[in-house]
Interface confidence: medium
């Protein structure tokens, strides 16, 4: 999505092997510089750019609409509750906000892919940062939900008790703060950069190669591997406890969170595998050639599209897997459509726990 400019080299046309052979004999490096710096060939990217031009604007436009509607619905349902939100609901509300903010940047990237970046350096920084903040926030909030469930079920501890909501609020604030920290490079290094060859302006990074690789590793670890490990660990233990206790109702209630985590893994794993290949090419562990570079660029576009689909997927999962969400949504629509018929609304069967559709005191999502 965001292009990168690095101060580590003037790139060579050859692949890594040739680069390392030739650079060591012909290039003059400073004391701490080695010829491992030079690993990227300047491949013509006509195919990947044409692919992006055709594929991304349509995809981003669709995801923008679906994401806005879906996450808007989730937020509306959660905020329409008269009682305090459970910890999981609070995390889900923040998740919906994160996903909404992420999809809000998609029209800008659609224009960038279709034509060029016409919004200036300021918005380039903001959109890039917003995009990454919410990418990280989505993953970390899902990890928080799983940790909350883990404490609640495995250790029978309600860390985020409904009484004082300070802990859950502090956790969410910590997540957003951490995401802001992760997005600092975007604020500093992103800018609208005119590309002479394309005769177009694009929102690009402008920082050293080591920074580019470090940022990719951070994205891979903090935005994917760590949250996924936390989720896997927590839900493995939760399922083990529930199976031992033969809590069928609880197991049914776990359905949605498991589906949400599986969706996260399925949506983001392909992209991060491609990023891993890119990192390995940056580090010289994989030879970089024009064919591979072009394939990686196209793969990155396709798999990132799949990843952004995750923003629209959660609301759909709640709608199709979460019975309680459907009930809340139906009630909200009734209330919006028929303001004078509130007394006629059908109360959900689990009205004794009417305050939440992802009950903290239960395994999770109690109405399933």
């Amino acid at each position: 999505m965001v292009l990168e400019v690095s101060d580590h080299q003037v790139l060579n046309d050859a692949e890594v092997a040739a680069l390392l052979e030739n650079f060591s004999s012909s290039y003059d490096y400073g004391e701490n510089e080695s010829d491992s710096c030079c690993t990227s060939p300047p491949c013509p990217q006509d195919f990947s750019l044409n692919f992006d031009r055709a594929f991304l604007p349509a995809l981003y436009s669709l995801l923008f609409l679906l994401g806005l509607l879906g996450n808007g619905a989730v937020a509306a349902v959660l905020l329409s509750r008269r009682t305090a939100l459970s910890s999981t609901d609070t995390f889900l509300l923040h998740l919906a906000v994160a996903d909404t903010l992420l999809v809000l940047t998609l029209p800008l990237w659609a224009v960038d892919a279709a034509v060029q970046w016409v919004f200036g350096s300021g918005l380039c920084k903001v959109a890039g940062a917003l995009f990454n903040i919410n990418f990280y926030a989505g993953a970390l909030l899902l990890a928080c939900i799983s940790f909350d469930r883990y404490l609640n079920i495995v250790h029978a501890t309600q860390l985020y008790r409904r009484g004082p909501p300070a802990r859950v609020t502090l956790t969410c604030l910590a997540v957003w703060g951490l995401c802001l920290l992760f997005a600092l490079p975007d604020f500093i290094f992103l800018s609208a950069h005119h590309d002479e060859r394309l005769n177009a302006t694009h929102c690009q990074y402008n920082f050293p190669q080591v920074g580019r690789t470090a940022l990719r590793v951070l994205q891979l670890v903090a935005g994917f591997l760590l949250p996924l490990l936390v989720m896997a660990y927590c839900y493995a233990h939760i399922l083990a406890v529930l199976l031992v206790s033969r809590g069928q109702r609880r197991l049914r209630a776990m359905r949605l969170v498991v589906v949400v985590v599986v969706a996260f893994a399925l949506c983001w794993t392909p992209y991060h595998l491609v990023v891993l290949v890119d990192i390995l090419m940056d580090l010289g562990a994989l030879a970089r050639n024009c064919g591979r570079e072009s394939r990686v660029d196209v793969a990155k576009s396709v798999t990132s599209g799949l990843g952004y689909m995750h923003c629209c997927l959660n609301p759909l999962l709640y709608a199709f897997v979460g019975v309680k969400f459907r009930e809340r949504m139906w009630m909200l629509l009734l209330r919006l459509g028929c303001p004078n018929q509130r007394g006629l609304q059908r109360q959900p069967s689990s009205s004794r726990r009417d305050s939440s559709w992802s009950e903290t005191s239960e395994a999770s999502y109690s109405g399933l």
Partner: antibody, heavy 123, light 106 residues
């Protein structure tokens, strides 16, 4: 409009030194790698030196390595070529040239050239 | 070092002619770049990545080739095309140019 204006050329004796300058305008100088390319009278083009956009990395062919030093002052939008131990074969028109950036990568070719400054090494 | 040899070194042709300039590399290169230079002027980027025309270059110019042999072709020579053309490689340092092909009016 991209403009590169070389200066500092002139007549110098063998073994002498000279410092060429190239004033850049019309583009974000700090974002581009820059090079010097020379052309001996009536002869072809020869790459002399390259510097990365931040000035961290410098590149030279063996023919000038150790004698020529490329540098840049990004605050002044200026590229320099310090030439020491000059020889008769260094007599040439010296052009300052810009490397394009495409999808975040420097390219090896040159998309803009200055008009050049003539360096004559003769006793 | 990779040597680039252009042929012919001199070429006399008439307006409307189809002209081909060849650039041979002593060992395989990934891409070739072509520059046009007129007397007393700085070179101008003409073709990049073997076959892409630089902005403002007329469509009568084309580039092709791979490995060791690359060509620049002018389908119908125009008066403003008479100049010297140089090929360049950036596959292996030092980054060399061909000796040039001077295109003259017959």
């Amino acid at each position: 409009e991209v403009q590169l204006l070389e200066s500092g050329g002139g007549l110098v004796q063998p073994g002498g030194s000279l410092r060429l300058s190239c004033a850049a305008s019309g583009f974000t100088f700090t974002s581009y790698a820059m090079s010097w390319v020379r052309q001996a009278p009536g002869k072809g083009l020869e790459w002399v030196a390259t510097i990365s956009h931040g000035g961290t990395y410098t590149y030279y062919p063996d023919s000038v390595k150790g004698r020529f030093t490329i540098s840049r002052d990004n605050a002044k939008n200026t590229l320099y070529l310090q030439m020491n131990s000059l020889r008769a074969e260094d007599t040439a028109m010296y052009y300052c040239a810009r490397h394009p950036i495409y999808s975040g990568n420097y390219q090896g070719y040159f998309d803009y050239w200055g008009q050049g400054t003539l360096v004559t090494v003769s006793s | 070092d990779i040597q680039l040899t252009q042929s012919p070194s001199f070429l006399s042709a008439s307006v409307g002619d189809r002209v081909t300039i060849t650039c041979r590399a002593s060992s395989g290169v990934n891409y070739i770049y072509w520059y046009q230079q007129k007397p007393g002027k700085a070179p101008k980027l003409w073709i990049y990545f073997t076959s892409n025309l630089a902005p403002g270059v007329p469509s009568r110019f084309s580039g092709s080739g791979s490995g060791n042999e690359y060509t620049l072709t002018i389908s119908s020579l125009q008066p403003e095309d008479f100049a010297t053309y140089y090929c360049q490689q950036f596959t292996s340092s030092p980054y060399t140019f061909g000796q040039g092909t001077k295109l003259e009016i017959k």
